[in-house]
C-alpha cells in the first residue's frame, strides 16, 4: 500500500509539469523574464529570435484579466499576486553604468527556474515545484 501511495504521489506531482511550463511561459511573454539567464549557455534557441525592436518598453499590467489563475486541484480562481517584474539584465545599448545593478538582477532571476525545482519564479501564491528534467529551457537571445 505504501509503495502505491508513493507512486501515486509521484504521478500527482508529475501531472502538472506541462501546466507549470505553460504558466511560466505565459508569464514570460508578459514580463519578458530573462529565461536565457537561467541556463549558462551561449547557444541560440532554435525557434526564438531576438526582435529588431530597440526600445526599452516598461512592463505594465492591465486590469482585465491579470490576478487570476486557476489552481490545479480545484476549480476555484485564486489571486495571482503579480509584482511588477523588472526585466533583468536587458542587453540594451547605452547606460553601461547600470551593469552592476543588472548583474544583481540576473543573479536573482537565475534562481527562478532550475532543472531541480522552481522557486521564486515570480508566480507568488502559486506553490510550484518541478523535479522533472524537462523544465522550460528557452534560451532566447536578446540584442
Amino acid at each position: 500500500k505504501r509503495a502505491v501511495s508513493e507512486h501515486q504521489l509521484l504521478h500527482d506531482k508529475g501531472k502538472s509539469i506541462q501546466d507549470l511550463r505553460r504558466r511560466f511561459f505565459l508569464h514570460h511573454l508578459i514580463a519578458e523574464i530573462h529565461t536565457a539567464e537561467i541556463r549558462a549557455t551561449s547557444e541560440v534557441s532554435p525557434n526564438s529570435k531576438p526582435s529588431p525592436n530597440t526600445k526599452n518598453h516598461p512592463v505594465r499590467f492591465g486590469s482585465d484579466d491579470e490576478g487570476r489563475y486557476l489552481t490545479q486541484e480545484t476549480n476555484k480562481v485564486e489571486t495571482y499576486k503579480e509584482q511588477p517584474l523588472k526585466t533583468p539584465g536587458k542587453k540594451k545599448k547605452g547606460k553601461p553604468g547600470k551593469r552592476k545593478e543588472q548583474e544583481k538582477k540576473k543573479r536573482r532571476t537565475r534562481s527562478a527556474w532550475l532543472d531541480s525545482g522552481v522557486t521564486g519564479s515570480g508566480l507568488e501564491g502559486d506553490h510550484l515545484s518541478d523535479t522533472s528534467t524537462t523544465s522550460l529551457e528557452l534560451d532566447s537571445r536578446r540584442h
Partner: antibody
Framework: QVQLVESGGGVVQPGRSLRLSCAAS????????MSWVRQAPGKGLEWVAT????????YYPDSVKGRFTISRDNSKNTLYLQMNSLRAEDTAVYYC???????????WGQGTLVTVSS | QLVLTQSPSASASLGASVKLTCTLS???????IEWYQQQPEKGPKYLMD???????STGDGIPDRFSGSSSGAERYLTISSLQSEDEADYIC?????????????FGGGTKLTVL
C-alpha cells in the same frame, strides 16, 4: 473591449513579400504577448508566430522560420507580420491573437486573407 | 510528437447536450489544453483551458452551458441546452515549451450541427 483588426492581406505572387498589420485597442497593448495564427481554406488552424510584450522575444514554427518575422510597435498599438518568400501553401486567413495570464490565444481578430498565386 | 485528435463531425438536437472529445497523444496525456469555438465565417473564440484533473477556466463572456472534463488522455467539452448559435467548429489546442522550443498545435476541429 478588446479589439483586434487585421489588414494588409491580398493576392501576391509566389516568392514575393507581404506585410500584415493588426491594430489593437481596448487594452494596454504593451503589456501582452501577441501571436499570429493562420487557417488555410477549408483547413484547420496553424500557429505562425508569437512575440513577447516588449518585442524582445519571438517564436516561430519550422514551417515559417526564416521567412516570416513578427514585430510590434507599442507606440502605435500595432502588431506586424512580415512574410517573405511566400509559397502557395501560405494561402490562408491570418488572425492576430492576444494572450492573457491564463492562455495563449484569448482574444482574436476577424482575420485577413492572403492568397499566394501566380 | 504532440498531436491532438478530434472527430470531424458531431450532431445533437436543439436543447439537448453534446460531449465533444479531444484526444492527446498518449505520452502527453497529462497536458492542459484549450478549447476554441469558430462560428461560420468568423474568427475563433477562446472558450476555456482544461487541465488533466478536469478543472477548467472559461474565457470572457462564455456561458456556463460550456463545461470541460478530463479522463486519461481525453479532454471533453460539454455543451448543454444547445442553441442554434452553438452550431460551429470546436477546436482544441495545446502548447508546450520543451528543449528550448515553443510549440503550439491545434486539433483538426469538430463540426457541430444543431438539429
Amino acid at each position: 473591449q478588446v479589439q483586434l483588426v487585421e489588414s494588409g492581406g491580398g493576392v501576391v505572387q509566389p516568392g514575393r513579400s507581404l506585410r500584415l498589420s493588426c491594430a489593437a485597442s481596448g487594452f494596454t497593448f504593451s503589456s501582452y504577448g501577441m501571436s499570429w495564427v493562420r487557417q488555410a481554406p477549408g483547413k484547420g488552424l496553424e500557429w505562425v508566430a508569437t512575440i513577447s510584450s516588449g518585442g524582445s522575444y519571438t517564436y516561430y514554427p519550422d514551417s515559417v522560420k526564416g521567412r516570416f518575422t513578427i514585430s510590434r510597435d507599442n507606440s502605435k498599438n500595432t502588431l506586424y507580420l512580415q512574410m517573405n518568400s511566400l509559397r502557395a501553401e501560405d494561402t490562408a486567413v491570418y488572425y492576430c491573437a492576444r494572450q492573457t495570464t491564463m492562455t495563449y490565444f484569448a482574444y482574436w481578430g476577424q482575420g485577413t486573407l492572403v492568397t499566394v498565386s501566380s | 510528437q504532440l498531436v491532438l485528435t478530434q472527430s470531424p463531425s458531431a450532431s445533437a438536437s436543439l436543447g439537448a447536450s453534446v460531449k465533444l472529445t479531444c484526444t492527446l497523444s498518449s505520452q502527453h496525456s497529462t497536458y492542459t489544453i484549450e478549447w476554441y469555438q469558430q462560428q461560420p465565417e468568423k474568427g475563433p473564440k477562446y472558450l476555456m483551458d482544461l487541465k488533466q484533473d478536469g478543472s477548467h477556466s472559461t474565457g470572457d463572456g462564455i456561458p456556463d452551458r460550456f463545461s470541460g472534463s478530463s479522463s486519461g488522455a481525453e479532454r471533453y467539452l460539454t455543451i448543454s441546452s444547445l442553441q442554434s448559435e452553438d452550431e460551429a467548429d470546436y477546436i482544441c489546442g495545446v502548447g508546450d515549451t520543451i528543449k528550448e522550443q515553443f510549440v503550439y498545435v491545434f486539433g483538426g476541429g469538430t463540426k457541430l450541427t444543431v438539429l
